[in-house]
């Protein structure tokens, strides 16, 4: 999987002059239509409410550091997180929560109640997702928090728990 | 948050001539790769099944009017709505519904049953989302309808109930 | 709805020369910013776990064949599937599953348990979605598998069950 980053901002592109001076295909390929994206799967071992991610996923124009996606290019981003829960029901209902944080502030959350019958069953599956469309500046951090990280079953579902962002429109 | 709109259609862009005549960066920045988007949160006080939205959200190339997003530029749009419900369970099950309407016609809906055990519980959380990919013409309206607007908890979850659209591909 | 395909790859575009030689608007419109997308609704009659789709939906730069979307242009794709289930509850819980397959390998799955109270109720609605961001090569197949296709209610909800892909970034 490619993990290359985008070293130059479009302002550095010599659109007139250089080897590219009269070749429009070359010019267009270096035009200011930046793309940045990430798609990371949850880390195998979770031990806190702030989720950690496998940094060997897809990263392009976005950095990963200490559980955070760190934005490299300003613009309007589409952010989406999806989590697969597996709950061993106790004898009461359980509220599952997924929080999307921007710079450590809760920007959006999703909640679902499971085990509502109050019966102790073998297991209950629940899938929870949350999206966000937001302007993000350089060095903005994106992270995910859950109350009940113990219900994210990374052995059964190592591929199902993902955090993804992609730049929709840069801010030029 | 920016709420700027797009005043000119690309046909008005003087791609040859004008101040921009020989500056390719200038030309490219004004090229026909339009982007339009919206991200609105639900209004604080809901009193009907057609949802109202806070017009001070993100609006770019899309207008908001009377509960509708009004399309300004034709093309293929990705539309997504997400609602957070909080239900005080009666002694019967409750069907939560989210309808996406295009020009007042139901284009897509999502349904989930909660309180299925028939037990009166304190509360049950449920998150519901719906997306759509569709060609929309100028002045097309996008709106959202729910049966049970009283279960959309705008005081606890003012940020969780959103309607968003973005132009994927214009129709040039 | 348009079902046109993209006949030329950008390498065939005469960016210098031809009628387009000095008209930048013309050049830009034919520039190498390919877009490919699909939005298909589930077929009316389902009889196996691999879902079939109505090929008269939106198809642009993507082919449909035997339940598969077949990729025509390499790149990073956003893939999303949403299914609406209607379950006549038996006297045990039911696990609903949605699998996204790339080339017949499970790439991502979502599971939700319904009817968890073990009570035989009239019906329970459940909506399930799954997304994916992945690099796909030419001729890659995208398909959807469910355990319980009999619970996908195509008569009540013919429009609610969709598979959609769109190219986010081509691999040039």
């Amino acid at each position: 999987q490619r993990t290359d980053s985008i070293p130059n901002s479009p302002d550095n592109i010599p659109l007139r002059g250089g080897n590219c001076s009269e070749d429009l295909l070359c010019i267009l390929k270096r035009a200011p239509f930046k793309k940045s994206w990430a798609y990371l799967q949850v880390a195998k071992h979770l031990n806190k409410t702030k989720l950690s991610w496998n940094k060997d996923g897809i990263l392009h124009g976005v950095r990963y550091q200490d559980g955070n996606l760190v934005i490299q290019f300003p613009g309007l981003y589409f952010i989406i997180c999806q989590l697969q829960f597996l709950v061993q029901c106790p004898n009461n209902s359980v509220d599952l929560k997924l929080e999307l944080l921007i710079n450590k502030h809760i920007k959006k959350q999703a909640l679902v109640t499971v085990c509502e019958s109050g019966m102790q069953t073998k297991h209950v599956y629940q899938n929870l997702s949350q999206f966000l469309l937001d302007y993000l500046q350089v060095n903005t951090t994106v992270s995910v928090n859950v109350d009940t990280f113990q219900y994210i079953d990374t052995s059964t579902f190592p591929l199902e728990n993902v955090l993804s962002v992609f730049l929709y429109s840069n801010s030029d | 948050q920016r709420t700027d709109s797009i005043p000119n259609s690309p046909d008005n862009i003087p791609l040859r001539g004008g101040n921009c005549s020989e500056d390719l960066l200038c030309i490219l920045k004004r090229a026909p790769f339009k982007k339009s988007w919206a991200y609105l949160q639900v209004a604080k006080h809901l009193n009907k099944t057609k949802l109202s939205w806070n017009k001070d959200g993100i609006l770019h190339g899309v207008r908001y009017q009377d509960g509708n997003l009004v399309i300004q530029f034709p093309g293929l749009y990705f539309i997504i709505c997400q609602l957070q419900f909080l239900v005080q369970c009666p002694n019967n099950s409750v069907d939560l519904k989210l309808e996406l309407l295009i020009n007042k016609h139901i284009k897509k809906q999502a349904l989930v049953t909660v309180c299925e055990s028939g037990m009166q519980t304190k509360h049950v959380y449920q998150n519901l989302s719906q997306f759509l990919l569709d060609y929309l013409q100028v002045n097309t309206t996008v709106s959202v309808n729910v049966d049970t607007f009283q279960y959309i908890d705008t005081s606890t979850f003012p940020l969780e109930n959103v309607l968003s659209v973005f132009l994927y591909s214009n129709s040039d | 709805q348009r079902t046109d395909s993209i006949p030329n790859s950008p390498d065939n575009i005469p960016l210098r020369g031809g009628n387009c030689s000095e008209d930048l608007l013309c050049i830009l419109k034919r520039a190498p910013f390919k877009k490919s997308w699909a939005y298909l609704q589930v077929a009316k009659h389902l009889n196996k776990t691999k879902l079939s789709w109505n090929k008269d939906g939106i198809l642009h730069g993507v082919r449909y064949q035997d339940g598969n979307l077949v990729i025509q242009f390499p790149g990073l794709y956003f893939i999303i599937c949403q299914l609406q289930f209607l379950v006549q509850c038996p006297n045990n819980s039911v696990d609903l599953k949605l699998e996204l397959l790339i080339n017949k390998h499970i790439k991502k799955q979502a599971l939700v348990t319904v009817c968890e109270s073990g009570m035989q109720t009239k019906h329970v609605y459940q909506n399930l979605s799954q997304f994916l961001l992945d690099y796909l090569q030419v001729n890659t197949t995208v398909s959807v598998n469910v355990d319980t296709f009999q619970y996908i209610d195509t008569s009540t909800f013919p429009l609610e069950n969709v598979l959609s892909v769109f190219l986010y970034s081509n691999s040039d």
Partner: antibody, heavy 124, light 111 residues
């Protein structure tokens, strides 16, 4: 190199519950998925069920109401319980490693390491 | 879940090639590329010979190969040898997240 060893009673009375244990040596039980399979004399193989390190299980639908598979990571063991035994449950019972890798995709490598099997007879 | 369908027996002479078929449904063999083949000698545990339709584990002879078309998978053994005489079972992952086996095929090496 991972090795598996089944243990448990060779004889079970009708209507009783069979309890078998599989001990894993040469590797951590937490790193893989584990299955039980059985084979009546002169007949084919029948998959019974699997357990993940988390304790999550999948069972053969035809046996689901009678089967419980559990794991004890501290002892590097997993167990099978099969209730309401009848003569039709007489078979050789095998435990096996159910090798799945999750990288970019799920890759199912099949049942790649097996125990030698233990014979269970149901008789009064 | 119904067992996959295999021929009860096949035979061949040393040096020949034989093919064993395994027919499933659109809920198992047809939908996933997760077909395995096992070899079992009398009184022994099964041994994995092919996984994911056509892949061989290390240590398995390249005389063994697998393929699949539609709902049917096949195991081909070329250059048949006397030690290949055994029972062969196919297996497939199913939509219910389970494994299903074939009924087994007895391979006899003639001569």
């Amino acid at each position: 190199q991972v090795q598996l060893q089944e243990s448990g009673p060779g004889l079970v009375k009708p209507s009783e519950t069979l309890s078998l244990t599989c001990t894993v040596s040469g590797g951590s039980i937490s790193s893989y998925i584990w299955s039980w399979i059985r084979q009546p004399a002169g007949k084919g193989l029948e998959w019974i069920g699997r357990i993940y390190a988390s304790g999550n299980t999948n069972y053969n639908p035809s046996l689901k109401s009678r089967v419980t598979i559990s794991v004890d990571t501290s002892k590097n063991q997993f167990s099978l319980k099969l209730s309401s035994m009848t003569a039709a449950d007489t078979a050789v019972y095998y435990c096996a490693r159910d090798y799945r890798v999750a990288g970019t995709y799920y890759y199912y490598y099949g049942l790649d390491v097996w125990g030698q099997g233990t014979t269970v007879t149901v008789s009064s | 879940q119904s067992a996959l369908t295999q021929p009860a027996s096949v035979s061949g002479s040393p040096g020949q090639s034989i093919t064993i078929s395994c027919t499933g449904t659109s809920s198992d063999v047809g939908v996933y590329d997760y077909v395995s083949w096992y070899q079992q000698h009398p009184g022994k545990a099964p041994k994995l010979m092919i996984y994911e339709v056509s892949n061989r584990p290390s240590g398995v002879s390249n005389r063994f190969s697998g393929s699949k078309s539609g709902n049917t998978a096949s195991l081909t053994i070329s250059g048949l040898q006397t030690e290949d005489e055994a029972d062969y079972y196919c297996s497939s992952y199913t939509s219910r997240s389970t494994w299903v086996f074939g009924g087994g095929t007895k391979l006899t090496v003639l001569g």
